[in-house]
């Protein structure tokens, strides 16, 4: 299709080489088309271009994204060619940064329902550059935590080194929805609730004598509880003896509850005690089996191919540890009678 009629938007993504970060493009179909289409109101009133109405579908995923190759080849369907780019409803998510993401991205409705719809498209020219500003050592992270129940703030990474007075007007989005009241480089949260968690996008306009473009950054905000003050709690095994059948295989599970820690390095391992000897056992990887805001339950199993007489003389010890301390639970095997 002819993309010359598409409205055009220029965006800049300056990524930090030190951290993992994501990026998003919104399918900013001009008003009032978008209200039919993505049920979103992303553009501020100043940004709304005049367009003929688009007789769009109500299906949120009914948009098609393309990339325009720089060599003039035909448009490429994003879903087929770019595994690190994911379409979610009207949003395009870039999972990994890199200059190779630079280029022109076009979105338009899949279903063309009227002659006007042919021109109902947006072309986004994305420039991606690594951050070079070494003077701003403490720029805000693209992953920010808010402590539940307390006061907090979300900073726009690309503007966090500027004072509020210097900062240009910022447009904020949360999970793709415009936060119309937020215009500064920092969102202040009086009391943090779990609904403050989400993907925030901050945009501001930068201009030179030739043109203007939108500088965008994405912030993943997580609501967290305070770090635990407790060592891990072993949920299983509870009993210190297990009745088993000789010659049969046996799996013993160790499950432990680890309280939340911002820097989380849980340890869960099995070792065997046999008279004066003690050694760690090579066992399958630990796995998380339940995770909540406050804690995580991790399981690690020890597998005996067949229980021997020697195993009855040994103690099987599960050892768990976090930054606060460690806990152990030992199990002695006992032959099942009758």
């Amino acid at each position: 299709f002819n993309i010359s009629g598409c409205s055009t938007k220029k965006l800049l993504w300056t990524y930090s080489t030190r951290s993992e970060e994501e990026f998003v493009l919104f399918c900013d179909l001009p008003e009032p088309q978008k209200s039919h289409f993505c049920h979103r109101n992303r553009l501020s009133p100043k940004q709304v271009p005049e367009h003929l109405p688009f007789m769009g579908s109500n299906d949120l995923s009914d948009v098609q994204w393309y990339q325009q190759p720089s060599n003039g080849d035909p448009l490429e369907d994003i879903r087929k060619s770019y595994p690190h780019i994911i379409q979610d409803k009207c949003t395009l998510h870039f999972l990994t940064p890199g200059v190779n993401n630079s280029g022109s991205y076009i979105c338009r409705p899949k279903m063309i329902k009227s002659p006007y719809d042919v021109a109902c498209c947006v072309k986004m020219i994305l420039e991606v550059k690594p951050q070079t500003n070494a003077s701003c050592e403490y720029s805000a992270s693209h992953k920010q935590d808010l402590l539940l129940g307390s006061t907090g703030s979300i900073s726009c990474p690309s503007l966090s080194c500027q004072s509020d007075a210097q900062s240009p007007a910022v447009t904020w989005y949360k999970n793709g929805k415009l936060l119309s009241v937020e215009r500064s480089n920092r969102i202040v949260v009086d009391e943090v609730y779990d609904y403050h968690q989400g993907t925030y996008v901050c945009d501001y306009t930068q201009s030179d004598t030739v043109s203007s473009w939108t500088v965008r950054a994405v912030v993943q905000v997580r609501t967290i509880v305070g770090d635990t003050k407790l060592k891990p709690d072993i949920l299983d095994p509870v009993e210190d003896t297990l009745e088993v059948e000789l010659g049969k295989p046996l799996t013993i599970s160790c499950k432990a509850r680890f309280g939340f820690e911002r820097v989380f390095n849980p340890v869960i391992k099995w070792y065997i005690k046999d008279s004066d000897l003690e050694w760690e056992v090579s066992v399958p990887e630990a796995k998380s089996i339940k995770s909540t805001l406050k804690d995580e339950i991790i399981e690690r199993n020890i597998i005996l191919e067949k229980v021997t007489q020697r195993d009855l003389r040994r103690k099987f010890v599960c050892f768990v540890q976090n930054s606060i301390g460690n806990t152990t639970q030992s199990v002695q095997l006992k032959e099942k009678r009758g």
């Epitope: 949920l235 299983d236 509870v238 009745e243 799996t251 013993i252 599970s253 499950k255 339940k290 199993n301």
Partner: antibody, heavy 119, light 111 residues
Framework: QEQLEESGGGLVKPEGSLTLTCKAS????????IYWVRQAPGKGLEWIGC???????TYYANWAKGRFTISKTSSTTVTLQMTSLTAADTATYFC?????????????WGPGTLVTVSS | AQVLTQTASPVSAAVGGTVTINCQSS????????LSWFQQKPGQPPKQLIY???TLASGVPSRFSGSGSGTQFTLTISDVQCDDAATYYC???????????FGGGTEVVVK
């Protein structure tokens, strides 16, 4: 959707036997214990026992040892075999899941199945 | 076997008021915190409200809270609603799993 469902309840004569089944769906059962709990009409809850799915090790309330047997019969089903039944065993029998053999987090229950022991 | 003794039934409460139910164990529960609270309405299975003595189960309103350690535990329902009329059970887990037990139940009547 995570679910547990009991089946096999019904009318049984005194001294008779009955096997109840608990079927799990919508979650990986291997990390859990399956508990059996009963409730006589108009009375409170009574813990019968549990089984570790990973290794089939069982624990029973002292009063239930001998007459009640909990087994894993497939990767998604657990049974409760009851023998020498009396009128006192008339109850709704529930299965539930927990991550530990020592009541920790019984977050999912079946709707229950009614067992009536009567001549 | 361990015995869990609960506040005698029935307990009356006014809408908007506060209800406290106690549960006493004949021996310390495992890790001093293996005590759960359940709500049961006629014809329904029990629904877990609190586990680990004080942790609110998923989807349970924060009007419900649990406290206690060792042998003495309390369930508190603040800002009582009509929907809170039910029987409440405590359940204890022990170092010998065979001792696991439920309390006798406490019926809450909301006026």
């Amino acid at each position: 959707q995570e679910q547990l469902e009991e089946s096999g309840g019904g009318l049984v004569k005194p001294e008779g036997s009955l096997t109840l089944t608990c079927k799990a769906s919508g979650f990986t059962i291997s990390s859990y214990y399956i508990y059996w709990v009963r409730q006589a009409p108009g009375k409170g809850l009574e813990w019968i026992g549990c089984i570790a799915i990973i290794n089939s090790i069982t624990y029973y309330a002292n009063w239930a040892k001998g007459r009640f047997t909990i087994s894993k019969t497939s990767s998604t089903t657990v049974t409760l075999q009851m023998t020498s039944l009396t009128a006192a065993d008339t109850a709704t029998y529930f299965c539930a899941r927990d991550l530990s053999s020592s009541i920790y987090d019984m977050d999912l229950w079946g709707p229950g199945t009614l067992v009536t022991v009567s001549s | 076997a361990q015995v869990l003794t609960q506040t005698a039934s029935p307990v009356s409460a006014a809408v908007g008021g506060t209800v406290t139910i106690n549960c006493q164990s004949s021996q310390s529960v495992y890790n001093n915190n293996r005590l759960s609270w359940f709500q049961q309405k006629p014809g329904q299975p029990p629904k877990q409200l609190i586990y680990r003595s004080s942790t609110l189960a998923s989807g349970v309103p924060s009007r419900f809270s649990g406290s206690g350690s060792g042998t003495q535990f309390t369930l508190t329902i603040s800002d009582v609603q009509c929907d809170d009329a039910a029987t409440y059970y405590c359940a204890g887990g022990y170092s010998s799993s065979s001792d696991n037990a439920f309390g006798g139940g406490t019926e809450v009547v909301v006026k």
